[in-house]
């Protein structure tokens, strides 16, 4: 950056070089340059002149102020009009930056994926701070009391392997940058208590003529928990609202659930599970796509990443892909 | 700006009970705990307790287990303790200040005397 | 309860001088130990966090040291404005604790 540069001078900042976004800031400039009393100070901010709000100090110092500045970084420097010098002289440059401290970092939450061999904490870290914020995250065991430390710029994943105070700890998360620090409060967990089931999976559908048309949906988890408890939403493409249906579930086998659906309409699925009675659920599943036949079954068009075809008495859909949704992801 | 502002002075006789508060702004209560601290004159630091405004979850130093009892009002952003059966043993600086581990943010104290 | 003693009680010192203030545990409490600096009739401000963080606007004069029992307040060269009290206390465990506090004076 510009701090690099040779310097015939000094440049500095008030109230620091880092400073909350919306301040008056005020950028010093002292000229010490052989043989050369600067017959002008100027200041530039990324490469631009700037003209106005300058205060002349002395023969070597000068000021620039800025009311309400707003920029996250920019890079000033400033130069001399030395007498007999045709070019101005460059006195030196500083790097600065403006932003927010740390809100209290809130909603933290660890859940462990079955299989990933990790304990995965994620929290809100609140309003953009526009500097380097770091996060400490406290890991305290409730049964050694030994804490751990785990420095990251955002989330984090921690190996369960590392986690050998036993079941219980406490987890909380410390914000800091330039301008100030913040703490979350502390979340209790159970190692237990906070796995999530492998992902469930909806593979296939069909939609079988019968007198009343019946959909079965065609899904499942590698997961070795016993006692898992899953939720299916589905609705009409068209539609806002979903419909939930809740199963209780052994995943020693593929599910089949059935659905009485409306002819010739296009539906999406979802599925999500957990493990019963615990407290996190799976994202919800990728949007599954299945369009039912009309009343007489009829060739249909290919549905959104999956294939949907007439098989004489059913007309079925398989998945050929992934397309993540979070919980929160409604389609139109 | 983060502020936590204490009740004013308080002049009590023994036996009686005081309510001190400790009005905060700049942050939700309800992110933060809440803990209050007794300063004698020319003594150390002691921690009384510790409350979470969020569900009113309290923990207290044993010590203080019976004379202190910690409150908040999340509509006002407010803290409150409430200090009883007071002796001039209670006679104290009292100071509110919020955290978990590190305490950065500090009422200005309100000064309590029991006389009879 | 973890006990925190500081220690000396007072010092007196001149403008310049580098001071050193100690702060020991009665059993291991990690880094989990901040100091606060008290001047005359006000509130204790938060210098040093974890041990050895620098709180925001701190001067870097202030520099904290240690870990497990033994911990260091260090003023690399004392100003007249640095006249107050000194308190470290722990945050490893419930209930929080604090030294009694280190006076320090201006010659």
């Known amino acids: 950056g510009i701090t690099n540069i040779n310097c015939s001078g000094h440049i500095w900042v008030e109230p620091a070089t880092i400073f909350k976004m919306g301040m008056n800031i005020s950028i010093y400039c002292q000229a010490a340059i052989k043989n050369c009393q600067p017959r002008k100070l100027h200041f530039y901010k990324n490469g631009i002149k700037e003209r106005f709000q300058i205060t002349r100090i002395n023969k070597t110092t000068a000021r620039l102020w800025y009311k309400n500045f707003l920029e996250p970084h920019a890079s000033m420097y400033c130069t001399a009009e030395c007498p007999k010098h045709f070019q101005e002289t460059l006195i030196c440059g500083k790097d600065i930056s403006s932003g927010y401290p740390p809100d209290i970092p809130d909603e933290v939450t660890c859940v462990i994926y079955e299989y990933s061999g990790n304990m995965t904490c994620t929290w809100n870290a609140g309003k953009l701070t526009y500097i380097d914020t770091k996060y400490v995250v406290h890991v305290k065991s409730l049964e050694t009391e030994e804490e751990q430390q785990y420095l990251t710029s955002s989330y984090i994943n921690i190996s369960t392997d590392s986690l050998q105070g036993g079941k219980k700890y406490l987890v909380w998360v410390q914000a800091a940058n330039a301008l100030g620090m913040e703490e979350s409060k502390q979340l209790q967990i159970h190692l237990d208590d906070i796995v999530i089931p492998s992902a469930a999976v909806i593979s296939r559908a069909e939609t079988i003529n019968a007198t009343v048309p019946k959909t079965i949906i065609y899904w499942d988890s590698q997961t070795t928990i016993e006692k898992v408890s899953c939720e299916m939403r589905y609705k009409a493409t068209t539609n806002q609202t979903w419909n939930v249906k809740e199963f209780d579930t052994n995943f020693t086998y593929v599910q089949q659930s059935e659905f009485y659906l409306e002819p010739n309409i296009k539906y999406v699925f979802q599925v999500r599970c957990q493990e019963t009675g615990k407290r996190y659920w799976q994202p919800w599943s990728s949007l599954f796509f299945h369009k039912t036949p009309e009343t007489v079954p009829q060739v249909t068009s290919k549905a959104f990443q999956h294939d949907t075809w007439n098989s004489g008495l059913t007309v079925a859909s398989i998945s050929t892909g992934h397309l993540t949704s979070d919980n929160r992801g409604d389609i139109g | 700006q983060i502020q936590l502002v204490q009740s004013g002075a308080e002049l009590v006789k023994p036996g009686a009970s005081v309510k001190l508060s400790c009005t905060t702004s700049?942050?939700?209560?309800?992110?933060?705990?809440i803990h209050w601290m007794k300063q004698r004159p020319e003594q150390g630091l002691e921690w009384i307790g510790r409350?979470?405004?969020?569900?009113?979850?309290?923990i207290y130093a044993s010590k203080f287990q019976g004379k202190a009892t910690l409150t908040t009002d999340t509509s006002s952003n407010t803290a409150y303790m409430l200090l009883s059966s007071l002796t001039s043993g209670d006679t104290a600086v009292y100071y509110c200040?919020?955290?978990?581990?590190?305490?950065?943010?500090w009422g200005q104290g309100t000064t309590v005397t029991v006389s009879s | 309860d973890i006990v925190m003693t500081q220690s000396p009680k007072s010092m007196s010192m001149s403008v310049g001088e580098r001071v050193t203030l100690s702060c020991k545990a009665s059993e291991n409490v990690g880094t989990s130990v901040s100091w606060f600096q008290q001047k005359p009739e006000q509130s204790p401000k938060l210098l040093i966090y974890?041990?050895?963080n620098r709180y925001t606007g701190v001067p870097d004069r202030f520099t904290g040291s240690g870990s497990a029992t033994d911990f260091t307040l260090t003023i690399s060269s004392v100003q007249a404005e640095d006249l107050a009290d000194y308190h470290c206390?722990?945050?490893?465990?419930?209930?929080?604790?604090f030294g009694g506090g280190t006076k320090l004076e201006i010659k």
């Open positions: 974890g041990a050895s």
């Open positions: 200040t919020r955290g978990t581990s590190w305490f950065a943010y």
């Open positions: 409350i979470d405004p969020a569900n009113g979850n309290t």
């Open positions: 206390g722990q945050s490893y465990s419930y209930p929080r604790t």
């Open positions: 700049g942050f939700n209560i309800k992110d933060t705990y």
